[in-house]
Interface confidence: low
């Protein structure tokens, strides 16, 4: 078993003779709302080329965050195999990666990479200085079991509003019910404590429930 880490310059058929694509990136971006646009500008026109642009996370570029694949005969493909919520847009000499639902612990350095596959010669880029993405704002907690896009803010606002209105209605209804119930209970109690004209055994079982009243207080 050969365990090799082969650098690009070991491939004679795909060597690029000093013809590396240069990449420009912003030195730093701040993601206040857990989203950010990272633009990778290239010294090369990508129009009608077959290319693979990717964004990598970490000093060692160990995590491939997002891929934009362009082919002159196909629609642009944008995807992430590592669970990032990403989108991409293509310019003539740029690819913009739009990352959403970033977590605070994903603050890191991000590198743009580009490979032009066709037509020849094969080209890739000189390693750029990278962009430090500093994630601030809402502290999203990653859910490893069910990773997925969080609800848009306006949906939460609408749901919150509906719940608030519902709570208010329930509270008002409860107060109205309570007032009516109290009034009904008072009327019911007064009726129960009126001196019966024909006292009979049928009323006796109500007596323990009637609070004692001072009828002298009703006299003028």
């Amino acid at each position: 078993m050969l365990r090799l880490l082969l650098a690009l310059n070991l491939f004679p058929s795909i060597q690029v003779t000093g013809n590396k694509i240069l990449v420009k990136q912003s030195p730093m971006l701040v993601a206040y709302d857990n989203a950010v646009n990272l633009s990778c500008k290239y010294s090369y026109n990508l129009f009608s080329r077959e290319f693979r642009a990717s964004l990598h996370k970490g000093l060692d570029s160990a995590v491939e965050v997002c891929v934009v694949y362009g082919n002159y005969s196909q629609q642009l493909q944008v995807y992430s195999k590592t669970g990032f919520n990403c989108d991409g847009k293509l310019g003539n000499e740029s690819v913009t990666f739009y990352l959403q639902n970033l977590y605070v612990n994903q603050t890191d350095i991000y590198f743009c990479k580009i490979e032009v596959m066709y037509p020849p010669p094969y080209l890739d880029n000189e390693k750029s200085n990278g962009t430090i993405i500093h994630v601030k704002g809402k502290h999203l907690c990653p859910s490893p079991l069910f990773p997925g896009p969080s609800k848009p803010f306006w949906v939460l606002v609408v749901v919150g509003g509906v719940l608030a209105c519902y709570s208010l209605l329930v509270t008002v209804a409860f107060i109205i019910f309570w007032v009516r119930s109290k009034r009904s209970r008072l009327l019911h109690s007064d009726y129960m404590n009126m001196t019966p004209r024909r006292p009979g055994p049928t009323r006796k079982h109500y007596q323990p429930y009637a609070p004692p009243r001072d009828f002298a207080a009703y006299r003028s």
Epitope: M1, L2, R3, L4, L5, L6, A7, L8, L10, F11, I14, R52, S54, H56, S61, E64, Y69, Q77, K81, K113, E115, M117, Y122, D124
Partner: nanobody, 120 residues
């Protein structure tokens, strides 16, 4: 331990076809990008083709584009290279390799290779 075992090489006449296979083990094959590379006698290693983990995206060296087809069967942990319209210059030892990133960013593991000889 990562293992890549190539098979299917042999002697074939110009214009003929061969199908190479690579049995992979020791890693999660369905999440790994894979490549085929070759080394002709007395020459350096040449990258031939690359396929992404899901099997949707493929890339080819200009010398084989339109003649070779890379594919994979993730359920069988196997990588394939269908070679048609073979030429004398395709004679080489063909290596199956795991590619951590894009097509041009090299390999981290390679198999022992299988020899393909195109000759009349």
């Amino acid at each position: 331990e990562v293992q890549l075992l190539e098979s299917g090489g042999g002697l074939v006449q110009p214009g003929g076809s061969l199908r190479l296979s690579c049995a992979a083990s020791g890693f999660t094959f369905d999440s790994a990008n894979m490549s085929w590379a070759r080394q002709a006698p007395g020459k350096g290693l040449e990258w031939v083709s690359w396929i992404e983990a899901p099997g949707v995206q493929t890339f080819y060296a200009d010398s084989v584009r339109g003649r070779f087809t890379i594919s994979r069967d993730n359920s069988k942990n196997t990588l394939y290279l269908q070679m048609n319209s073979l030429r004398a210059e395709d004679t080489a030892v063909y290596y199956c390799a795991r590619s951590p990133f894009g097509p041009l960013y090299g390999f981290d593991y390679m198999g022992q290779g299988t020899l393909v000889t195109v000759s009349s």
